[in-house]
């Protein structure tokens, strides 16, 4: 028969022969022959391969370096890489999460729209009219101005995006 020029799924072509790929979690030791199946070996401790493959070496699991603020979110297996995340108060600098930076704080006049996670930074938003933030914080949202009316008080000093209104007693001499 004519030697193949293409192979089925989960096979590869080597020297005019279709050989089975090694399953995830295993590496290639020896190509198949007409008489012998592809020889594969399981990846060692702290190694993985996550696809059907013909790799002769497994990949090393990612190391979550605590010196870079990293910790293990999900331990790797022979078929999956380790997933790192950042320590509390820090987030990844990239999708690959190779290092961490401190969550940013929202300055006075800005509130937290979305609290940071291990993989995303704090999202701040300017405090709209009627709201304020007078602190630098990674958690505080913009607070609404105090409603003087509900306390039977009047506004003595208008609020800003950084300060609350100041309420005071009503002028009793007023008709």
């Amino acid at each position: 028969p004519e030697p193949p020029t293409a192979c089925r799924e989960k096979q590869y072509l080597i020297n005019s022969q279709c050989c089975s790929l090694c399953q995830p979690g295993q590496k290639l030791v020896s190509d198949c022959t007409e008489f012998t199946e592809t020889e594969c070996l399981p990846c060692g401790e702290s190694e993985f391969l996550d696809t059907w493959n013909r790799e002769t070496h497994c990949h090393q699991h990612k190391y979550c370096d605590p010196n870079l603020g990293l910790r293990v979110q999900q331990k790797g297996t022979s078929e999956t890489d380790t997933i790192c995340t950042c320590e509390e108060g820090w987030h990844c600098t990239s999708e690959a999460c190779e290092s961490c930076v401190l969550h940013r704080s929202c300055s006075p006049g800005f509130g937290v729209k979305q609290i940071a996670t291990g993989v995303s930074d704090t999202i701040c938003e300017p405090c709209p009219v009627g709201f304020f933030s007078n602190v630098s914080s990674a958690f505080e949202k913009c607070h609404p101005w105090t409603s003087c009316e509900t306390k039977d008080l009047v506004v003595q000093q208008a609020g800003t995006n950084k300060t609350d209104v100041v309420c005071g007693p009503q002028d009793r001499l007023r008709a």
Epitope: N15, T33, E34, F35, E39
Partner: antibody
Framework: QVQLVESGGGVVQPGRSLRLSCAAS????????MHWVRQAPGKGLEWVAV????????YYADSVKGRFTISRDNSKNTLYLQMNSLRAEDTAVYYC??????????WGQGTMVTVSS | EIVLTQSPGTLSLSPGERATLSCRAS???????LAWYQQKPGQAPRLLIY???ARANGIPDRFSGSGSGTDFTLTISRLEPEDFAVYYC??????????FGGGTKVEIK
């Protein structure tokens, strides 16, 4: 460890039969093709036969075709060579060897077959 | 059928010397599927080199294989006492039959 052990050799008269066995251990026997190779006294190596891992494909050297039959029992991790109509020129040490894309990587210690009247 | 011719038939050398063994094929060996084996008296052959130039597991680096097509060479850079043996080349690309060369005996001078 990975090992092949041949047995069944001996002295036999011309025209008679003999069955050689090769017991495998230390590896997944059912994933490998297997060969028989022989060596006449004081001579070089001569390939005899090969069988595929599942026993479907078999090839023979012209010198033994029609007289020798290679077979295997994967449940017993054993390879066989049935030798019929033996001749004086079949006298040799018979080795079994494992097939890989790297050549014959594991060999047994051999079993001696002497065909003599 | 691919015929393999090995030369010389016998090589007489002293320990520490370099040994160069030749294997010539009657036609090109596809994919360089050529192996070298070592055999000592009363023992089974042992795989040394496969794919013309790759060392098998546990084989010392003083053994090296080279060549392609029809001309192949096994070199032992510095002969050790345990290297005196018979060496066979074998092609496993074109079969049946899988063919062996006639062998080269490396003996102590």
């Amino acid at each position: 460890q990975v090992q092949l052990v041949e047995s069944g050799g001996g002295v036999v008269q011309p025209g008679r039969s003999l069955r050689l066995s090769c017991a495998a251990s230390g590896f997944t026997f059912g994933s490998y093709g297997m060969h028989w190779v022989r060596q006449a006294p004081g001579k070089g190596l001569e390939w005899v036969a090969v069988i595929s891992y599942e026993g479907v494909k078999k090839y023979y050297a012209d010198s033994v075709k029609g007289r020798f039959t290679i077979s295997r029992d994967n449940s017993k991790n054993t390879l066989y060579l049935q030798m019929n109509s033996l001749r004086a020129e079949d006298t040799a040490v018979y080795y079994c060897a494992r097939d890989t894309s790297r050549g014959h990587d594991i060999w047994g210690q051999g079993t001696m077959v002497t065909v003599s009247s | 059928e691919i015929v393999l011719t090995q030369s010389p038939g016998t090589l007489s050398l002293s320990p520490g010397e370099r040994a160069t063994l030749s294997c010539r094929a009657s036609q090109s060996v596809s994919y360089d599927y050529l192996a070298w084996y070592q055999q000592k008296p009363g023992q089974a052959p042992r795989l040394l080199i496969y794919g013309a130039s790759a060392r098998a597991n546990g084989i010392p680096d003083r053994f090296s294989g080279s060549g392609s097509g029809t001309d192949f060479t096994l070199t032992i850079s510095r002969l050790e006492p345990e290297d005196f043996a018979v060496y066979y080349c074998q092609q496993y690309a074109d079969y049946p039959p899988f063919t062996f060369g006639g062998g080269t005996k490396v003996e102590i001078k």
